[in-house]
């Protein structure tokens, strides 16, 4: 899968509509185990004069908790700028609107800088043919396949998509 | 161990551009990502950008974003610092090295000499 490391280029507005998380991965293992800050999933995103707003579902207490983030664009043109956590410098690494997306996010909170990368698709029975793209952006940007989570059903919290 | 040397460095007035160029020795070169650092006198060695293994993902510090440009080409083991729109602040000491991923966290003390970048006003 040969990605073009850059926003789609039809726009950002593509990247709307529904989306399945499939694989986290990171530096920080705790960020994306069970309870982790960054074991979210994303529901649905929109994109509204360069930015991208996204919906995505937290688990909490057994339920999942839906919340919507706004990534704002910066004089990059792949790059934006997220509060969630503390701040974030939200890279989209690689597009192919209508069936996978890899972001990837260099956190900084306090002190603390980490490094979390997503996997999304627009089908999950597609799924395993975009593992293979997701392990090859994490390799490239420092990440290792044992740091690689993939998500189950049950993971992704499922029963809250409506 | 990885060998790097640091070059390009100058005296340069404000606003003015530099190349730095940094060359490791070793095979392994493009199983790296690699970053450049700074230190200035009296402070702390400080990350000033990364770039992936492949050479195709990036990532700036705030206070170089826009105008400083991480490139690197596997095939000559060389990483480069294009730095455009020079300023005093700009002033330190500038180090290449490997690093574990994106973030800038160091993998092993592997630095180079360094080569001295000086911004008049």
């Known amino acids: 899968q040969e990605g073009n490391h850059e926003e789609p280029q039809g726009g950002l507005e593509e990247l709307s509509g529904r989306w399945h998380s499939v694989a986290l991965a990171s530096n920080k293992s705790d960020l994306i185990k069970p309870w982790g800050h960054f074991r979210v999933f994303i529901h649905s995103m929109s994109a509204k004069d360069g930015n991208l707003h996204g919906d995505i579902l937290i688990p909490q207490d057994g339920q999942c908790e839906k919340v919507s983030l706004t990534a704002f664009k910066t004089a990059t043109s792949n790059k934006f700028d997220l509060e969630y956590w503390g701040h974030n410098d939200l890279y989209l690494a690689e597009v192919d609107p209508k069936s996978y997306l890899i972001l990837y996010m260099i956190n900084q909170y306090n002190d603390d800088t980490s490094l979390v990368a997503h996997l999304m698709v627009r089908d999950l029975s597609r799924q395993q043919d975009f593992l293979p793209a997701f392990e090859s952006v994490c390799e490239d940007i420092g990440l290792h396949k044992d740091q690689i989570v993939v998500l189950s059903d049950d993971d992704r919290c499922q029963g809250s998509r409506d | 161990a990885v060998q790097l040397v640091d070059s390009g460095g100058g005296l340069v007035q404000a606003g003015d551009s530099l190349r730095l160029s940094c060359v490791a020795s070793?095979?392994?070169?493009?199983?790296?990502?690699m970053g450049w650092f700074r230190q200035a006198p009296g402070k702390e060695r400080l990350i000033v950008a990364t770039?992936?293994?492949?050479?195709?993902?990036?990532h700036y510090a705030d206070s170089v974003e826009g105008r400083f440009t991480i490139s690197r080409d596997n095939a000559k083991n060389t990483v480069y610092l294009q730095m455009n729109s020079l300023e005093p602040e700009d002033t330190a000491v500038y180090y290449c090295?490997?690093?574990?991923?994106?973030?800038?966290?160091?993998?092993?003390?592997?630095w180079g000499q360094g080569t001295q970048v000086t911004v008049s006003s």
């Open positions: 090295t490997p690093v574990s991923d994106l973030t800038g966290r160091r993998l092993g003390s592997y």
């Open positions: 070793g095979r392994t070169f493009s199983s790296y990502v």
């Open positions: 770039i992936s293994k492949s050479g195709s993902l990036t």
